[in-house]
């Protein structure tokens, strides 16, 4: 019986030599389970596996510990791949991470960090960050160090409120801190002051809601 | 200790623009929004607007959209607030405040001593 | 823009009474709400913040409470610097919006 080929992340799909972006199924480290990403193959030399999307609020991220533990919403369009595959993953090997942030006026900016990772579900998927470069703010809009993740109904943020019901979506809240790149989507016009928006501090401050987020990573050595 | 000592009272005939500063001392001045509150004589508490140290932005009451302007001097630490085209309703005393977090508009624990509007002709 | 009702707008006490301070919000509004205090001729002073966390050096008579759209204020034993205005404060949504306020007076 042939054996079939397997992709641990949208890298090893653009080393087998498929170079077209789309929708790729993976297969988690160490494990027959599955699951569909989409894999961006022109961005900065390819191989990105896309871990966030948001563009047009057409998916609700206010979604439950468990939904964010195995991702919603269509690789294609708004969606969360899932923190146990990525958790997995990054745990394999050295990640890096792109955030790539579009506003409402046409500008686009990213945030890069060299190294990657998340925890375990036992220790709520804290995030794990170093070495930012970029154009989206010389701080880092996800505060350092990393924070455990909170949901809805998940609350390990450090506040004495629950950032994920406050502010909405489930991120890795401080107190609340930063960003939110899970908030609430606004429509343009309806995009300033907005403190439970899509937000990304130390690019466009306070109360600003982005039109569009993309969250993805690939292996340091790619 | 923490303080934000404000201007003067000013007196402005209907028309004009008033700008009002408020000082900080005792905090790092870029870490926290300021927003500016009013008080009608006899009457309660009004938001007008906030604005972040940090980086300039600003968010207004909508009911102020168009009068009223919000700027910094970080090298003084002094936030200012200027409301023109002043009416006699505009007669309040008008308050900075400093807000717990510079990340979101919360709760305010630091207030200034009040300023002293009077709009008349 | 959230509306925050407060009751009652005035209440005459007398030292040692307990006082209670409603505040009723248009809409859900989680648990952020703050409390302050102003006395004649100065600015408001914090008391309480997130429904009912005490802001540092607020005695313990002071206490918060409620969530969602009912929030409490409760002077349990009114002392003499305690006659004075009480604000709620809405900081859950954009505006911020504050109550009417209440009087606390002595009877």
């Known amino acids: 019986k042939e054996e079939q080929i397997t992709f641990r992340d949208c890298a090893d799909v653009f080393r087998s030599g498929l170079t077209t972006s789309g929708i790729y199924t993976l297969t988690f480290p160490n494990s027959t389970e599955e699951t569909k990403a989409y894999c961006d193959m022109e961005t900065g030399g390819g191989g990105w596996t896309t871990i966030q999307r948001r563009e047009d609020g057409s998916v609700d991220f206010q979604r439950t510990w468990k939904e964010y533990k195995v991702g919603f919403g269509n690789p294609s369009g708004e969606h969360w791949l899932g923190n146990e595959f990525v958790s997995q993953l990054t745990n394999q090997q050295r990640y890096v991470l792109k955030i790539h942030l579009r506003d409402w006026e046409g500008n686009e900016a990213y945030s890069l960090y060299e190294h990657f990772y998340l925890s375990s579900e036992e220790f709520n998927y804290r995030i794990h960050l170093k070495g930012l470069t970029g154009t989206a703010g010389k701080i880092s809009s996800i505060s350092q160090p990393g924070n455990d993740f909170s949901t809805k109904d998940a609350d390990n943020d450090k506040c004495i409120c629950k950032c994920s019901q406050m502010l909405t979506g489930g991120w890795w809240f401080d107190a609340c801190g930063p960003s939110n790149l899970n908030g609430m989507y606004y429509p343009q016009r309806q995009n300033t002051n907005k403190f439970n928006g899509i937000k990304w501090y130390y690019w466009k401050g306070s109360g600003y809601s982005l039109k569009a987020t993309t969250m993805m990573i690939r292996p340091a050595d790619f | 200790q923490v303080q934000l000592v404000q201007s003067g009272a000013e007196v402005k005939k209907p028309g004009a623009s008033v700008k009002v500063s408020c000082k900080a001392s005792g905090y790092s001045f870029t870490d926290y929004n300021m927003v500016w509150v009013r008080q009608a004589p006899g009457q309660g508490l009004e938001w007008m607007g906030y604005?972040?140290?940090?980086?300039?932005?600003?968010g207004y009451n909508q009911k102020f959209e168009g009068r009223v302007t919000m700027t910094t001097d970080t090298s003084t630490s002094t936030a200012y607030m200027e409301l023109r085209s002043l009416r006699s309703d505009d007669t309040a005393v008008y308050y900075c405040?400093?807000?717990?977090?510079?990340?979101?508009?919360?709760?305010?624990?630091?207030w200034g001593q009040g300023t002293l509007v009077t709009v008349s002709s | 823009d959230i509306q925050m009702t407060q009751s009652p707008s005035s209440v005459s006490a007398s030292v040692g009474d307990r006082v209670t301070i409603t505040c009723k919000a248009s809409q859900d509004v989680y648990i952020a709400v703050a409390w302050y205090q102003q006395k004649p001729g100065k600015a408001p002073k914090l008391l309480i913040y997130?429904?009912?966390t005490r802001d540092t050096g607020v005695p313990s008579r002071f206490s918060g409470s409620g969530s969602g759209t009912d929030f409490t204020l409760t002077i349990s034993s009114l002392q003499p610097e305690d006659f004075a205005t009480y604000y709620c404060h809405q900081y859950s949504s954009y505006p911020p919006t504050f109550g009417g306020g209440t009087k606390v007076e002595i009877k």
């Open positions: 604005i972040d140290p940090y980086n300039g932005g600003t």
């Open positions: 405040a400093r807000t717990r977090d510079r990340y979101d508009v919360w709760y305010f624990d630091v």
């Open positions: 997130w429904a009912s």
